[in-house]
Interface confidence: medium
């Protein structure tokens, strides 16, 4: 079943390569388990950036080696992606799945265009 997912259209990464955005889903039911996946679309290729499962009311945790971190509050997930470089500029899509209890719901956002600008190297001082 389909579910609406909202996310900002554009986000600019910080000079340290960190970008944060909110992914909000319109939950049609009372889910106890939610899975959030961040997908990156660039040059018509879609790749999975990170994924996490969380129980409602508990923290959102990604794998230890993930470039993503996040927190959840109600039907909102606050996502942070770190370690970004200019080549990582692209459309980052939030996919939300209500895993349990049935019925299963799937929602895919329109994507957040994240722009990453590599910082200019500091000039050498004589």
């Amino acid at each position: 079943k389909a579910m609406h997912v909202a996310q900002p259209a554009v986000v600019l990464a910080s000079s340290r390569g960190i970008a944060s955005f909110v992914c909000e889903y319109a939950s049609p039911g009372k889910a106890t388990e939610v899975r959030v996946t961040v997908l990156r679309q660039a040059d018509s290729q879609v790749t999975e950036v990170c994924a996490a499962t969380y129980m409602m009311g508990n923290e959102l945790t990604f794998l230890d080696d993930s470039i993503c971190t996040g927190t959840s509050s109600g039907n909102q997930v606050n996502l942070t992606i770190q370690g970004l470089r200019a080549m990582d500029t692209g459309l980052y899509i939030c996919k939300v799945e209500l895993m349990y209890p049935p019925p299963y719901y799937l929602g895919i956002g329109n994507g957040t265009q994240i722009y990453v600008i590599d910082p200019e190297p500091c000039p050498d001082s004589d």
Epitope: T32, A52, T53, M55, N58, E59, T61, L63, Y104
Partner: antibody, heavy 120, light 107 residues
């Protein structure tokens, strides 16, 4: 080292209920990073997932068994339990308890299993 | 429910052989697939999770690959202790399901 130990196996009469417990040692059942689950294996056959429980009490059941299954957790005893009612010979199996690390999408620790035989 | 079909169901090989076991899902499961090894009278042991990540303590001769609907478990050089039954399991959606198993025997 985490260990899971099932107890309560044996012979159960058809139409009765089986009750199994799994005691967790070497780690806390109250961690938010894990599910605790039950899986069974009929003699000479494959594996079947029965259900999971989260420390908060949220349960997740296989629809094929849902009407007969209850999984509960007792955090004070660091254990979780399985009750399966209205059993038949088809429920004869080795029952395993296991831990599922939420973010790894797999069962990484298993008990040694306990055999339940349904027979009159 | 998602069905997992393993092939072959039975495999006979020599020590030192390279063997591959395939697991096909009836619908896409991304990379939410695990592989287990089970020896007679013992509980299953986790080998691979999220399709290709080696569980800590598992020898590097084991490897996994695949995404979507087709997955493989490869043992690069069979050792005597590798003769066992292997199961794949999907954890993409409830109910979790297992493949029927592949029995690997010594030739």
């Amino acid at each position: 080292q985490l260990q899971l130990q099932e107890s309560g196996g044996g012979v159960v009469r058809p139409g009765g209920s089986l009750r199994l417990s799994c005691t967790v040692s070497g780690g806390s059942i109250s961690s938010s990073s894990y599910y605790w689950g039950w899986i069974r294996q009929p003699p000479g056959k494959g594996l079947e997932w029965i259900g999971n429980i989260y420390y908060s009490g949220n349960t997740y059941y296989n629809p094929s068994l849902k009407s007969r299954v209850t999984i509960s957790v007792d955090t004070s005893k660091n254990q979780f339990s399985l009750k399966l009612s209205s059993v038949t010979a088809a429920d004869t199996a080795v029952y395993y308890c296991a831990r599922r690390r939420i973010q790894l999408w797999s069962f990484d620790y298993w008990g040694q299993g306990t055999l339940v035989t349904v027979s009159s | 429910d998602i069905q997992l079909t393993q092939s072959p169901s039975f495999l006979s090989a020599f020590v030192g052989d390279r063997v591959t076991i395939t697991c096909r899902a009836s619908q896409g499961i991304s990379r939410y697939l695990a592989w287990y090894q089970q020896k007679p009278g013992k509980a299953p042991k986790l080998l691979i999770y999220t399709a290709s990540t080696l569980q800590s303590g598992v020898p590097s001769r084991f490897s996994g690959s695949g995404s979507g609907t087709e997955f493989t478990l490869t043992i690069s050089s069979l050792q005597p202790e590798d003769f066992a039954t292997y199961y794949c399991q999907q954890l993409n959606s409830y109910p979790y399901t297992f493949g029927q198993g592949t029995k690997l025997e010594i030739k």
